[in-house]
Amino acid sequence: SGTTNTVAAYNLTWKSTNFKTILEWEPKPVNQVYTVQISTKSGDWKSKCFYTTDTECDLTDEIVKDVKQTYLARVFSYPAGNVESTGSAGEPLYENSPEFTPYLETNLGQPTIQSFEQVGTKVNVTVEDERTLVRRNNTFLSLRDVFGKDLIYTLYYWKSSSSGKKTAKTNTNEFLIDVDKGENYCFSVQAVIPSRTVNRKSTDSPVECMGQEKGEFREI
């Protein structure tokens, strides 16, 4: 039970990529507004997105304080224009979110191939180390800073003239692969966190091919 004409939020869903984290819910408000609270399992509730008519709330600033913590959020419903009003139980209607552990659950964003360089029959492929919104000592950490060796990249590479994708893996952001002389190759990378059971893989990076401006060829 709650305030007259106020409905509880439902379908509370965490949307998170590279730690940019938004809580979404339904329904679109009719004569009501929402406030969100977030807490760690052992911490105090902190209010965000006060009396909003949105059905989403950016909670990134809170979760980046400790991405290995488990968070819970709740969405309160209030009648529009009468936010002091409470339900029959003496408090506004609210709904809890599922628990969310950013380190284990944030989606891995699409990686980008920064560069590739061929020297003879070797190609060095470098993956861009994407910046996250996680901070340490007032500087933003990269994905590699946050995940360390838990994060690997899988490189798919293939001759432009064929379809079979060879693979290589690295726990840095660089690959050094053997290629056939005189052949052009294409590359795509995927971020992977093998220790996870869900959200293990990112979407693939855009394909980059030799003979395009990103690469450099040196005959040795």
Partner: antibody, heavy 120, light 107 residues
Amino acid sequence: EVQLVESGGGLVQPGGSLRLSCAASGFTISQYWIHWVRQAPGKGLEWVGYIDPYNGYTYYADSVKGRFTISADTSKNTAYLQMNSLRAEDTAVYYCARDYGSLQVQLDYWGQGTLVTVSS
Amino acid sequence: DIQMTQSPSSLSASVGDRVTITCRASQDVNTAVAWYQQKPGKAPKLLIYSASFLYSGVPSRFSGSRSGTDFTLTISSLQPEDFATYYCQQHYTTPPTFGQGTKVEIK
């Protein structure tokens, strides 16, 4: 519990076709990679090919390239090995295996295998 | 493709014996080598990964080591259930390749 179950093996004539299935449970195939490995009677293990069910990327051993096709149906959590233009030398037990996908561990779980016999 | 040359192809040993099987890679494979055990009519089972790490649930009498491109599987004290065929495999490059196998038989 992670499990892989192959099916679809049997007797087929040279030049014929067969489709093997690898039904996975206990994990989501799109989050891993699936390999096929075969073993001719009394012989060693031979890698056939792999698929990344997330993007459909594949690679095949030279011995089967152009004849075999690996695919996956993520809604069924199942991988397939379509074998065409079969030869006597393709007679083997065919295993599917899960690739854990780390630098350290590759094929951590295997199915029980299904026997394919190519004979006239 | 990288060749994995395994030796011996077979050996006879008694319960309690120390058994060593070796595998040589035709080029550098770093530590991307696994060892599998296979019993007749059964699928291979992972024993050792990353050259020297014992896979979960595998008895500690099994161990692996690397020296350059040479890889060794050692069974410190052979048990009756260890009579089987053992395979090495590299997954450093595509395609992954297996050794020819070593059959460990009862003397």
